[in-house]
C-alpha cells in the first residue's frame, strides 16, 4: 500500500530561480496548497479498547504511532471512522459504541443497540461510523476507543474497519 | 466561540502591487481558492421538528439564522448531518427519520426502525446520518427536520448531534 | 440536474500569452487545481445485484457507463454510497449488505442485520452507508453491489440512494 512522504514545507519552496524560473505552471504545481491525509485499516488482532491500526495504509503528512494518528500540519481536518461489528447475541441487548478521541478527549461518539429482542440469535451485523470536523494543531493525536472491541469483525471483513483523516483547509 | 470572517472577494485581491508586489508565494497565499464551512452542534433544548443549532460553533463563510445555515458563496457543497437518538421503547416499533432540507425542500432523508421487537426495553441507542452533495447559491438555506426530535439525545451526548457543510468547489 | 463538462487538460492551459497574458488572477483561475466529482441517484427500476444509476445527476470529470463511474483524472478520491432500505420482514432475520467495488474488486462493504426478532412486522427501515478513500487511475471503475437489491426503497425515497465520488488530491 502507498505511503507517501511530505515535501518540504512551503516556506522552502524555491518559487523563483531553480528549474521553475518563470514557468508559472511549474510554480503553481509547487504552490503552498498542502494536503494531508491518512486511511488506515484496523489491526488484525485487537486486545484493548484503544484500537490499533495497520500502519502500512495511506499516510501523507500524518504519522502513525501507538494507535494514534499524529498530525504534522495544522488546519481544519475531516476525520471519519467506520467499523463493522459482528455480534453473537447473548440473551440481552448490546450497546456498541465508537468513540473518536482528540488528544485523549472523547470528541464524538456513536452508539447503536443491537440484539434488542433479547433472543440468542446466530449473529447480528452492525455497521457504525462517526465523523468530526475539527481544527488540529501539530502533534495532535487522533485515536479510536471501542469498549466492545471483541465484536469488531476483523476476520470476515478485514478491510471494512477504517480510520481516515484529511486536511480540508490549512491554517495559512 | 469561533466565528471566522471571509476575506474580501477574490476580485478584490490586489494581485499586483501592495505588499505582494512580485512575491509569488504571497500572491498564491492570497489566491482565489475560497473555502467555506460550518460545523454546528444541536441546541440543548429542542421543541419542534425543525432543529435548532448552537450558533457558537464553527462558521466560516456561512451564516446561521433561525435554524438555517445560510450560504454566502455559491458552489458545490458537501452537507452532512449526524444525530444520536436514545429511545425508551414503547410497545411498538419506532421509525426515526432525519430530513435534510435545502430552501425548505426535503432533498434527502434517512430512516431507521428501532424497537422492532415490540418489547418495552430500558433504552435503545441509534445513530443516524445523512449527506448531500449539491450546488448551492448565495442565500440558500440548509436545515434539518426530525419528527421524533424528542428522542434526540442532547443530555448524555451533547457533542454528537451535528450539522456540517463545506464548500468543495466554488462556482468560478 | 447539472452535468458539467471538464475543461481542457491542464497541460493545454495557455499560462503565458493569450487573453491571460500576465494577469495573475486570470492565470490562477485557470491553474491546475483540478476538481472532479459525481453525485448520482439510483435508477428507479433495479433488477440485478450491480446497481444502476441515473446518469442525469452531477458529473464533472467523471463518466457514467453501464452502472460504473469511470474516472478521468488520476488522484486520491473520496467515495461514498448511501442506501435506504425498506424491508417487509419475513420470519427470519435479514442481512443487508452494500459492497463498494473498484475495477470489479470488492474494496469495502457494510452489513447490517434487520428483522432480528424473527417477527413478521409491517416494515423495517434501515439506512446503510459506506465510504472509501483510494487512489484511482484513469479509467478506473467504481460500482456498487447489493445482494438484497429488492429491498432498496426507490419508490418512497427515490432521492435517498446515492453514489458520490470527489477528487481530494490530484496525482501531480
Amino acid at each position: 500500500q502507498r505511503t507517501d512522504s511530505i515535501p518540504n514545507s512551503p516556506d522552502n519552496i524555491p518559487l523563483r530561480g531553480g528549474n521553475c524560473s518563470e514557468d508559472l505552471l511549474c510554480i503553481l504545481k509547487r504552490a503552498p496548497f498542502k494536503k494531508s491525509w491518512a486511511y488506515l485499516q484496523v489491526a488484525k488482532h485487537l486486545n484493548k479498547t484503544k484500537l490499533s491500526w495497520n500502519k502500512d495504509g495511506i499516510l501523507h503528512g500524518v504519522r502513525y504511532q501507538d494507535g494514534n494518528l499524529v498530525i504534522q500540519f495544522p488546519g481544519l481536518y475531516f476525520i471519519i471512522c467506520q467499523l463493522q461489528f459482528l455480534v453473537q447475541c447473548p440473551n440481552n441487548s448490546v450497546d456498541l459504541k465508537l468513540e473518536l478521541l482528540i488528544n485523549k478527549h472523547i470528541k464524538k461518539q456513536a452508539l447503536v443497540t443491537v440484539c434488542e429482542s433479547g433472543m440468542q440469535t446466530k449473529h447480528v451485523y452492525q455497521n457504525l461510523s462517526q465523523f468530526l470536523l475539527d481544527y488540529l494543531q501539530v502533534n495532535t493525536t487522533v485515536s479510536v476507543n471501542v469498549d466492545t472491541f471483541q465484536y469488531i469483525d476483523t476476520s470476515t471483513f478485514p478491510l471494512e474497519n477504517v480510520l481516515s483523516v484529511f486536511l480540508y483547509s490549512n491554517s495559512d | 466561540q469561533r466565528t471566522d470572517s471571509i476575506p474580501n472577494s477574490p476580485d478584490n485581491i490586489p494581485l499586483r502591487g501592495g505588499n505582494c508586489s512580485e512575491d509569488l508565494l504571497c500572491i498564491l497565499k492570497r489566491a482565489p481558492f475560497k473555502k467555506s464551512w460550518a460545523y454546528l452542534q444541536v441546541a440543548k433544548h429542542l421543541n419542534k421538528t425543525k432543529l435548532s443549532w448552537n450558533k457558537d460553533g464553527i462558521l466560516h463563510g456561512v451564516r446561521y439564522q433561525d435554524g438555517n445555515l445560510v450560504i454566502q458563496f455559491p458552489g458545490l457543497y458537501f452537507i452532512i448531518c449526524q444525530l444520536q437518538f436514545l429511545v425508551q421503547c414503547p410497545n411498538n416499533s419506532v421509525d426515526l427519520k432525519l430530513e435534510l432540507l435545502i430552501n425548505k425542500h426535503i432533498k434527502k432523508q434517512a430512516l431507521v426502525t428501532v424497537c422492532e421487537s415490540g418489547m418495552q426495553t430500558k433504552h435503545v441507542y441509534q445513530n443516524l446520518s445523512q449527506f448531500l452533495l449539491d450546488y448551492l447559491q448565495v442565500n440558500t438555506t440548509v436545515s434539518v427536520n426530525v419528527d421524533t426530535f424528542q428522542y434526540i439525545d442532547t443530555s448524555t451526548f451533547p457533542l454528537e448531534n451535528v450539522l456540517s457543510v463545506f464548500l468543495y468547489s466554488n462556482s468560478d | 440536474q447539472r452535468t458539467d463538462s471538464i475543461p481542457n487538460s491542464p497541460d493545454n492551459i495557455p499560462l503565458r500569452g493569450g487573453n491571460c497574458s500576465e494577469d495573475l488572477l486570470c492565470i490562477l483561475k485557470r491553474a491546475p487545481f483540478k476538481k472532479s466529482w459525481a453525485y448520482l441517484q439510483v435508477a428507479k427500476h433495479l433488477n440485478k445485484t450491480k446497481l444502476s444509476w441515473n446518469k442525469d445527476g452531477i458529473l464533472h470529470g467523471v463518466r457514467y457507463q453501464d452502472g460504473n463511474l469511470v474516472i478521468q483524472f488520476p488522484g486520491l478520491y473520496f467515495i461514498i454510497c448511501q442506501l435506504q432500505f425498506l424491508v417487509q420482514c419475513p420470519n427470519n432475520s435479514v442481512d443487508l449488505k452494500l459492497e463498494l467495488l473498484i475495477n470489479k474488486h470488492i474494496k469495502k462493504q457494510a452489513l447490517v442485520t434487520v428483522c432480528e426478532s424473527g417477527m413478521q412486522t409491517k416494515h423495517v427501515y434501515q439506512n446503510l452507508s459506506q465510504f472509501l478513500l483510494d487512489y484511482l487511475q484513469v479509467n478506473t471503475t467504481v460500482s456498487v453491489n447489493v445482494d438484497t437489491f429488492q429491498y432498496i426503497d426507490t419508490s418512497t425515497f427515490p432521492l435517498e440512494n446515492v453514489l458520490s465520488v470527489f477528487l481530494y488530491s490530484n496525482s501531480d
Epitope: 470536523l133 | 469561533r2 460545523y39 460553533g57 464553527i58 451533547p158 | -
Partner: antibody, heavy 124, light 107 residues
Framework: EVQLVESGGGLVQPGRSLRLSCAAS????????MHWVRQAPGKGLEWVSG????????GYAGSVKGRFTISRDNAKNSLYLQMNSLRPEDSALYYC?????????????????WGQGTLVTVSS | DIQMTQSPSSLSASVGDRVTITCRAS??????LAWFQQKPGKAPKSLIY???SLQSGVPSKFSGSGSGTDFTLTISSLQPEDFATYYC?????????FGGGTKVEIK
C-alpha cells in the same frame, strides 16, 4: 519554562473598573486558549472567562457576563480582563490559566499551567 | 449550566491510606474532566485531564477514572505532601464549572 504572571489587581470602589493583565512566556502563546479563574478568600475555584487561540471563541460565567471583557494580544503574549461595574462579591484572587487546547469548536482540554494570581478587593 | 458535585467535602486520612474522591456531573460530559490540587496560599496544580490522563510530572499514585457523569480521583498511597484541597472541573461546554472541593486532612 512556562510562566504566567498576573498584574493589575488592587483595591477599588464598587462600580469602578479595573484591568488585569497576564504576561505569558515559555510557550507559543498564540497556539492555546487562555482563561481567568478566581477564588474568593476561603472559598472554592470559580471559572470567570475563557478565550480561544484566535479570540473567536469567548465565554463568560453568568455572574460576570456583561460586565467583564476578556481579550488577548498574541503579538505581546498577553491576556487581559477588563472588569467594569465591580461589586464586592468580585473580590478574589484572580488567576490566569493556560489551556492544553486551542478553544476552537469547544476544544478546551483542561488547564495545565496557572499563574500565582493577583488580588482584587472591591470595597468602599 | 452543568453542576459539578464533589463528595465528600472533607475527609481525614492517614499516611499510606488509599483515598477516593468522587465527582458527579449534572449531565454527560464524556471524559472532559480535570482534577486539580491546591495547597493553602498556592495556585492550583493540574493533576489529571481527560478524566484519566496524568499531566506530565504528576506521580503515578494519582489516577482518575470515569466517563459520562461519574468520575473518581484516587490517591493510592497518601503521603504528607498530598494533604490539600482537590477540585474537579468540567470543560465540555461554557460556562466551565468546578466542583466545590474536597479537603483532605491528616487524621
Amino acid at each position: 519554562e512556562v510562566q504566567l504572571v498576573e498584574s493589575g489587581g488592587g483595591l477599588v470602589q464598587p462600580g469602578r473598573s479595573l484591568r488585569l493583565s497576564c504576561a505569558a512566556s515559555g510557550f507559543n502563546f498564540d497556539d492555546y486558549a487562555m482563561h481567568w479563574v478566581r477564588q474568593a478568600p476561603g472559598k472554592g475555584l470559580e471559572w470567570v472567562s475563557g478565550i480561544s487561540w484566535r479570540s473567536g471563541n469567548i465565554g463568560y460565567a453568568g455572574s460576570v457576563k456583561g460586565r467583564f471583557t476578556i481579550s488577548r494580544d498574541n503579538a505581546k503574549n498577553s491576556l487581559y480582563l477588563q472588569m467594569n461595574s465591580l461589586r464586592p462579591e468580585d473580590s478574589a484572587l484572580y488567576y490566569c490559566a493556560k489551556d492544553k487546547g486551542i478553544g476552537f469548536n469547544w476544544n478546551y482540554e483542561g488547564f495545565d499551567y496557572w499563574g500565582q494570581g493577583t488580588l482584587v478587593t472591591v470595597s468602599s | 449550566d452543568i453542576q459539578m458535585t464533589q463528595s465528600p467535602s472533607s475527609l481525614s486520612a492517614s499516611v499510606g491510606d488509599r483515598v477516593t474522591i468522587t465527582c458527579r456531573a449534572s449531565q454527560g460530559i464524556s471524559n472532559h474532566l480535570a482534577w486539580f490540587q491546591q495547597k493553602p496560599g498556592k495556585a492550583p496544580k493540574s493533576l489529571i485531564y481527560a478524566a484519566s490522563s496524568l499531566q506530565s510530572g504528576v506521580p503515578s499514585k494519582f489516577s482518575g477514572s470515569g466517563s459520562g457523569t461519574d468520575f473518581t480521583l484516587t490517591i493510592s498511597s497518601l503521603q504528607p505532601e498530598d494533604f490539600a484541597t482537590y477540585y474537579c472541573q468540567q470543560y465540555v461546554t461554557y460556562p466551565l464549572t468546578f466542583g466545590g472541593g474536597t479537603k483532605v486532612e491528616i487524621k
